[in-house]
């Protein structure tokens, strides 16, 4: 039977001779050279050679356990003469014995990691891992221990796990953001003579909101013209915040001051500046300077840092309103004046007044827009705004005169304003009443006395306050007539009545009646109108049949006698 155990061979042999492995030996071997040993399998004849007489095995090359830790070979013992096996073929193992010839190697040459600034001591940052190719089952060749070579006192590493943790309180990103930590992994449990490898860990502190916004100055001043429309930006302020990203976002607000209603502040979403804007129309003449208190605050605060103080800051913003030369302002939006139609030329009707609203209070001159008073009926005193007539008026021609008055700053003619002026012409009784129409009537030859043959109406261009009251009478020259009479109905009408029984159209075919119409206003106005009465032949119903005389050739046929 075969006589051996498994063979052990130390790796990385550096001797000049072949490395002795061991001896194959059969108890059938008498030492007389009759047995021959044959080796086959992993590396036989190349890596491993055997003395066929003695069975001694040698390694011809340096072996590396990390490359191949075990070789499996087969041994044969044969009769040298016959070639027959003396022993059955047997498999055996050569196990390569480890030496500490490999240093630990990290899984990455460079690690990158982040950890929040101000993190508590012992906060996990990253885990590094090194592997050692040596045999972990034998000795300490592959027992790795981690240590920190660079990066103290900020960080520490757990020797067993390679977990890197923060080691210093209050690490401030705003003070230092980047750290380069060098970690060593050493085998042999870290003992002397162990092999080591290193890696670099680049650690970045990420931002937390541990800094409030701060205005670089306590007071800002801006100017804006009073004409700035609502929404106009008038200035920018910027609070600085040492934090970054969301933690540096700033909201601005007006917290106090007289301008709360007049101004607004918005945050520029890109630059994080506060933009002061006009909220309502300004008026230099009402208020020239506004003082606002503007606050800058972080919208995203971290409760754990509130102890550091309020995450806001305030500044005073002074806004000076610049005067803009404004046109004069009339005391009214429109003026209504009245004047009697009998007013003489140069009669003062009333006045307008305008004032420069600017602080300068520039003097103003007045004029009439001649496009609105082509006939130059009115004039204005350029200095005091008095309106007066320059022509005679007639209410019956035009009741209302609508003109425009212009006020212009004397020192700056570009600044002018206009106002409508409505002038009402008041009535004066300067027109006599007249017949409402031309009256031509007829009377039947067989008419009876006191018969109504015509109703008269009058009109008057005037417009008395209490209404028209007309009186009617026959003119003095006809008052004593025996033919017709007039009856005033006291309702602004009158009737023509017959005064006798029967008329002869052959004697008198036409009568002309002069009628006096008077009004009762002051001064009384009257006029005389003529009513023509024709004498006609009528049927028994009183219907006119013929008004023509058989011979109307005598001039005496026309009479004004009533």
């Amino acid at each position: 039977s075969w006589m051996w155990n498994q063979f052990f061979l130390l790796e990385e042999y550096t001797g000049s001779d072949y490395q002795y492995v061991g001896k194959l030996h059969s108890d059938q071997d008498r030492g007389d050279g009759s047995l021959k040993y044959i080796l086959s399998g992993d590396g036989a004849g190349d890596l491993f050679i055997i003395n066929e007489n003695t069975g001694d095995i040698q390694a011809t090359k340096r072996l590396d356990r990390e490359e191949k830790p075990v070789y499996i070979l087969r041994a044969q013992a044969v009769n040298r003469r016959t070639g027959r096996p003396v022993e059955p073929e047997s498999e055996f193992i050569i196990k390569i014995h480890d030496i500490n010839d490999n240093e630990p190697i990290f899984t990455k040459d460079v690690y990158t990691a982040t950890v929040p600034e101000m993190a508590d001591v012992g906060t996990f940052v990253v885990q590094v891992t090194a592997t050692d190719a040596d045999d972990p089952t034998y000795g300490n060749s592959a027992k790795v221990v981690y240590s920190i070579l660079q990066g103290q006192p900020y960080f520490s590493v757990e020797s067993e796990t390679g977990i890197i943790k923060t080691a210093l309180l209050n690490m401030d990103r705003e003070n230092r953001e980047q750290y380069q930590v060098v970690i060593q992994a050493k085998d042999m449990g870290g003992q002397m003579g162990g092999l080591s490898g290193t890696t670099t860990v680049n650690i970045t502190l990420t931002d937390v909101n541990d800094n409030p916004p701060r205005f670089p100055q306590s007071t800002y001043q801006f100017k804006t013209p009073e004409s700035s429309p609502p929404g106009t930006p008038i200035g920018r302020i910027k609070a600085s915040d040492a934090d970054v990203g969301e933690n540096a976002e700033i909201e601005y607000s007006i917290t106090d001051g007289e301008g709360h209603e007049m101004f607004d502040v918005i945050t520029d979403q890109e630059t994080q500046e506060g933009i002061i804007t006009v909220k309502k129309l300004l008026d230099f003449e009402k208020k020239k300077v506004y003082t606002l208190k503007v606050e800058a605050s972080n919208p995203h605060v971290e409760p754990r840092f509130l102890y550091l103080g309020p995450f806001k800051d305030s500044a005073t913003v002074r806004i000076v309103v610049d005067d803009v030369d404004e046109p004069p302002v009339f005391s009214k939006l429109a003026y209504i004046l009245q004047i009697r139609e009998d007013a003489r030329i140069n009669t003062t009707i009333g006045s307008v007044a305008a004032q420069d609203p600017d602080a300068a209070r520039n003097p103003v001159k007045y004029s009439v827009d001649r496009h609105t008073d082509m006939d130059r009926i009115f004039n204005i005193d350029s200095g005091n705004g008095s309106i007066f007539t320059s022509k005679l008026l007639d209410r019956e021609t035009l009741l209302w005169h609508n003109i425009t008055v212009i006020a212009t700053e004397i020192n700056n003619p570009k600044q002018s304003s206009r106002v409508p002026l409505y002038i009402k012409v008041l009535d004066v009784n300067d027109n006599a009443p007249e017949f409402a129409e031309f009256y031509e009537t007829f009377v039947c030859e067989k008419a009876k006395a006191d018969q109504l043959i015509q109703t008269l109406r009058a009109v008057d261009k005037d417009d008395p306050y209490s209404g028209h009251q007309f009186s009617f009478s026959l003119a003095p020259e006809a008052a004593s007539s025996s033919n017709f009479t007039i009856q005033d109905n006291k309702d602004n009408t009158a009737g023509i009545l017959t005064r006798k029984n029967g008329y002869n159209r052959h004697e008198m075919s036409t009568y002309l009646l002069p009628v006096v119409i008077s009004d009762n206003d002051y001064p009384v106005q009257s006029s005389t109108g003529t009513v023509t009465v024709r004498v006609c032949a009528c049927d028994h119903h009183g219907n006119m049949q013929s008004c023509h005389a058989e011979a109307l050739i005598h001039p005496t046929g026309l009479s004004t006698g009533a």
């Epitope: 929404g231 918005i266 945050t267 520029d268 890109e270 630059t271 933009i275």
Partner: antibody
Framework: EVQLVESGGGLVQPGGSLRLSCAAS????????MNWVRQAPGKGLEWVAR??????????YYADSVTDRFTISRDDSKNSLYLQMNSLKTEDTAVYYC????????????WGQGTLVTVSS | DIQLTQSPSSLSASVGDRVTITCSAS???????LHWYQQKPGKSPKLLIY???YLASGVPSRFSGSGSGTDFTLTISSLQPEDFATYYC????????FGQGTKLEIK
Amino acid sequence: EVQLVESGGGLVQPGGSLRLSCAASGFTFTTYAMNWVRQAPGKGLEWVARIRIKNNNYATYYADSVTDRFTISRDDSKNSLYLQMNSLKTEDTAVYYCVRPDYGNYGLAYWGQGTLVTVSS
Amino acid sequence: DIQLTQSPSSLSASVGDRVTITCSASSSISSHYLHWYQQKPGKSPKLLIYRSFYLASGVPSRFSGSGSGTDFTLTISSLQPEDFATYYCQQDIVPLTFGQGTKLEIK
């Protein structure tokens, strides 16, 4: 006077690519986020993409309909805005406007004249 | 995402009319973040009202804006011929969104 002039539009086949450019002038380009907005024929307005300023790391945002296909970029040294459009679809046919916000980066105050992109086979 | 819903979608009115367009947000937003635009056919949109109620430069005073939270309004006090256009509301929170538009037509 603020001016935005788009170029690069044209006819392209489905699946194709196109790069739009916008030349900006008359304002401080570096202080404004910039946008692309489009309008399909006879349809309403649709926001496409936005790019923020350098202080905000040129952060970009996209409409869901173009995410992973379109890329917005800017070159502050050239006062230029770009839109790289890949994997174009027929529904991308529209007039594309380059748009600058109002002061404070609110709203969309200034619009270019637009450039027409037609995606058709 | 914040959705904006405009009403009405279209509107017929006459010159001189008072017109109101509403914009409803799916969740509450600051008045700073809501804006109104006017667009005429073949033209780029034009900022009309910014931050809910401020008139953009050159916009006539007949336009006004109001609202807060989820409900915002654009009012034209007396329609002029040049006001017939499409109006959009828009909010600033990423992703930016627009209302679907209100087309204002001549009656």
